[in-house]
Interface confidence: low
């Protein structure tokens, strides 16, 4: 049975199998002799010279040689002598051959062949039957071993059990020796007693060779499934586990590789390895320094953390978050460098794992793969990084990584670039520095370019337009990136992104980049020009009707359409509008579109949020005489009086600045009587009187943030849902698919997907927030 | 439910010595690791040594030389036998008790001031 040969290239003196001898034959290119194909054969030669047409090589390549090699020549009566040399040793030419232990020691044969690199006509003829005696006499070893283990073992068994460790250490190296050959290897496997009383001589001993003879010999057992049963039926696996601890190199790289085959081939074998204390002892070697040792532990690691929690746990416990990403610091060896970051990948979808890699800057480290030319290697970096990426907004240091993924989105490889998207959308997310580094190496020029390549592709689309969303928002450079994104003619692709087939994700993300890119007074007539203003009004009444409907239907739970609520995208769209409307020709087109019923209806929502935006939005389209006069019409004095005594202080301003500017026509006695329910209600906890009055509202939210909103709240939600299809990663099916990373719709970094039942924890360990203050499409929190 | 109770630690001149010791009790899986860590104001937790219940030792390298730890499982107490001491050797010095049980569980001591100072 084959092991997994790339990983089995110890450095260990293992003498090779007889049977490798025989398949040599059997297996490996030999000289056709024409005998098996007939390739060659032509009628024998009569004057015994040899066929001219037999020899199947260059002929300006012999002649070459000849004239190189042999200056001088022959005269008649030479060439006469050499010939009856010939034709005196002929027979014996052909004993050579075919028979050459029956020759004499010392015995000169002339051969016919002047390059001896070159076989002759007669040695070539006989390599068949040189074959066929070699099969012969392996087939008569063969059942000799057999024999000769058959009538051992018994004997052999006992003395591995005597007191007197002479005579234990004499007969492990016996043992170990018949373990060598095939036939004797099968009589000892299937002898228990006999496997068993090398286990136990091999975890009892003091002597260093009699522990390197026995795990010697285990090993060479386990390169059969019959013999991987026999070790884990005799308790070989604790006894293995406890070699680990072995100061003794080849003990421990016997111990090693015996548990690997063991534990891929053997069922049961994981757990007895895990009970057995396997993982911490494997945590402790990861400091060797022997590449294929390291890898071979390391894939061993990744087989018993591959979907098992409390294994994930222990090799945190036993400090090997720490191990493996000093690993992936120090080595270039690609295999290595591969099954450690298998491991990390199985790791960094646990909560507890997560931040521990983070912490032993496990970021940094893999980052320093991307650009290998091991695909295998960069992909699981990729996969690695993008569910470790939510974990990672604090950290320090990520110049490098930044670079690197926005030089990836340019990749051909549609897996590299998700990936590259997804982590750059979380890096991005509530970090001002990463934000900032991302613009400068210019990574909105290459997510714009993504975006517009991804086509229909939402794995893809989707956390590009997040990481926009983040970076068009709430640092130095958002400004620049607004504008950025219409220079590269990204405004086109985006508000497309708002219309079929695009899901309720990445609409939701959509919006909240339209919303920011209309931070910009640049934008706002691009935008308009694209009929994005039409559709965000469409999608905002389908949304509501959404959502008027269930709650029609008694529903009072807020539901999930494809991981979105639809009262996000009913305040998403109003924030979009909202920051629309400070133009005056959208105020034009918001109005015509007959959204004022609409926008006062939303007065009356029970979400602070939407109350804020619709408020925020009447406020603007209030400026135009026209459109106050509709809003009063459509009764929206009453809700808004109400809003002046919201708790929020967004809601209560937009709400009195609506009303404030209702009130421009109406008479001085209305005007007042106005002002002071507006002091005595704004100005509930430091009352002053109004100043210009009639400047009210014109900065709330300059900036694009409502007045009352947090710039530096840090918190932030991390939720499931959704996620990639994982299938169409492209994943080696052995790969755990424990994806996650980035979470299609997601304002916030995003957990790996498995592991929902750790959500509310993540929840709880957040500092208390005024939600009322964190408006969904304010890209980052 | 585990119980850790530290005992020793204290003031000590470099290079001298001092012995800390740990005793658990309640309900111990067989198969776990017990061991030391230390932390110092404003610091992260830090390891020192471990050993296992088949008595495999480990020691991080500032301590390797100077620091011995022993266990009775018997007694499933664990000592730690600290010579030569440093002045950086000043911590609150916590025992670990690792069970390797389904989930594993970690439990610590309630924590030893050692103070290393001429």
């Known amino acids: 049975m084959a092991t997994q040969a790339d990983l089995m290239e110890l450095d260990m003196a293992m003498e090779p199998d007889r049977k490798a001898a025989v398949s040599h034959w059997q297996q490996q290119s030999y000289l056709d002799s024409g005998i098996h194909s007939g390739a060659t054969t032509t009628a024998p030669s009569l004057s015994g010279k040899g066929n001219p047409e037999e020899e199947d090589v260059d002929t300006s390549q012999v002649l070459y040689e000849w004239e190189q090699g042999f200056s001088q020549s022959f005269t008649q009566e030479q060439v006469a002598d050499i010939d009856g040399q010939y034709a005196m040793t002929r027979a014996q030419r052909v004993r050579a051959a075919m028979f050459p232990e029956t020759l004499d020691e010392g015995m000169q044969i002339p051969s016919t062949q002047f390059d001896a690199a070159h076989p002759t006509n007669v040695q070539r003829l006989a390599e068949p039957s040189q074959m066929l005696k070699h099969a012969v006499v392996n087939l008569i070893n063969y059942q000799d071993d057999a024999e000769l283990a058959t009538r051992a073992i018994p004997e052999l068994t006992k003395l591995l059990n005597d007191e007197d460790q002479v005579v234990v250490n004499k007969a492990a190296v016996m043992v170990h020796q018949l373990s060598k050959k095939e036939a004797s290897r099968h009589a000892i496997m299937r002898s228990p007693q006999m496997v068993s009383a090398i286990v136990r001589t091999m975890q009892n001993t003091n002597d260093v060779e009699t522990a390197r003879c026995t795990a010697g010999t285990l090993h060479n057992l386990s390169h059969h499934r019959e013999g991987l049963l026999a070790i884990f039926k005799s308790g070989g696996i604790p006894a293995l586990v406890k070699m680990l601890g072995s100061p003794v190199d080849s003990v421990l790289f016997y111990a090693i590789t015996t548990l690997h085959n063991l534990l891929l081939h053997q069922e049961g074998a994981k757990m007895a390895v895990r009970l057995a204390g396997g993982l911490q002892k494997m945590v402790a070697l990861l400091n060797k320094t022997n590449v294929k040792f390291l890898a071979i532990t390391t894939d061993c690691l990744q087989i018993l953390a591959y979907g098992n929690q409390e294994s994930k746990l222990i090799i945190l416990a036993s400090g090997g978050p720490q191990a493996l990403v000093n690993i992936m610091r120090t080595y270039t060896y690609e295999k290595l460098l591969w099954t450690t970051s298998r491991v990390l990948k199985v790791l960094s979808v646990c909560s507890s794992n997560k931040p521990a890699i983070v912490e032993a800057g496990g970021m940094q480290a893999l980052g320093l793969h991307l650009t290998d030319p091991s695909q295998r290697l960069v992909q699981n970096c990729l996969w690695t990084l993008r569910n470790l990426s939510d974990a990672a907004t604090k950290q320090e240091g990520m110049e490098g990584l930044l670079g690197t993924l926005v030089q990836l989105l340019g990749s051909d490889d549609i897996n590299v670039v998700t990936c590259a998207a997804g982590i750059l959308s979380n890096l991005t997310c509530n970090n001002y520095k990463n934000k900032m580094m991302v613009c400068q190496v210019g990574g909105i020029e290459a997510l714009v370019r993504t975006v517009l390549r991804a086509g229909d592709r939402e794995d893809i689309t989707e956390p590009a337009i997040c990481a926009l969303r983040h970076l068009t928002s709430r640092h130095q450079e958002a400004e620049m990136a607004q504008n950025a994104v219409r220079l590269h003619y990204g405004l086109p692709v985006v508000v497309k992104l708002l219309h079929p087939p695009s899901h309720w994700p990445l609409i939701k993300a959509t919006v909240g980049l339209i919303r920011n890119l209309a931070l910009c007074p640049a934008n706002h007539a691009p935008l308009r020009e694209q009929g994005a203003i039409p559709r965000l009004v469409q999608l905002l009444v389908r949304a509501h009707q959404d959502t008027q409907r269930r709650t029609s239907m008694g529903g009072t739970q807020q539901q999930f359409v494809e991981g979105v609520r639809m009262e996000e995208i009913v305040e998403g769209c109003t924030g979009a509008l909202h920051i629309l409307a400070r133009d005056v020709h959208n105020r034009i087109v918001i109005r015509g579109l007959n959204t004022i019923p609409l926008f006062v209806q939303l007065l009356y929502s029970p979400i602070e949020n939407i109350q804020r935006v619709a408020a925020g939005v009447l406020c603007e389209l209030a400026q135009d005489k026209e459109a106050a006069e509709a809003i009063e019409a459509e009764g929206a004095t009453a809700p808004l009086t109400e809003l002046l005594h919201s708790r929020n202080e967004g809601v209560a301003t937009y709400a009195a600045a609506v009303l404030f500017r209702m009130s421009e026509d109406k008479p001085q006695d209305y005007k007042k009587r106005l002002s002071v329910e507006l002091t005595s209600s704004l100005f509930r906890t430091e009352p002053m009187a109004w100043n210009e009055t009639a400047d009210l509202g014109l900065d709330i939210g300059a900036q694009g943030e409502p007045l009352g909103y947090r710039q530096d709240d840090p918190s932030y939600r991390s939720f499931h849902s959704g996620g990639y299809g994982q299938d169409a990663l492209g994943m080696d099916p052995m790969m755990e698919h424990e994806m996650g990373g980035h979470h299609p719709g997601a304002d916030y970094p995003v957990d790996g997907l498995p592991d929902l039942g750790h959500a509310q924890d993540l929840m709880d360990g957040l500092p208390p927030g005024d939600s009322n203050q964190l408006a969904w499409f304010d890209t980052d929190l | 439910q585990v119980q850790l109770v530290q005992s020793g630690g204290g003031l000590v001149q470099p290079g001298g010595s001092l012995r800390l010791s740990c005793a658990a009790s309640?309900?111990?899986?067989?198969?776990?690791?017990m061991g030391w860590y230390r932390q110092g104001p404003g610091k992260q937790r830090e390891f020192v040594a471990s050993?296992?219940?088949?008595?495999?030792?480990n020691y991080a390298a500032s301590v390797k030389g100077r620091f011995t730890i022993s266990r009775d499982n018997a007694k499933n107490t664990v000592n730690l036998q600290m010579n030569s001491l440093r002045p950086e050797d000043t911590d609150v010095y916590y025992c670990r008790l690792t069970m390797m049980t389904y989930p594993p569980t970690i439990s610590w001591g309630q924590g030893t001031q050692v103070t290393v100072s001429s």
């Open positions: 050993i296992t219940d088949s008595d495999l030792a």
């Open positions: 309640g309900s111990i899986s067989s198969n776990n690791v």
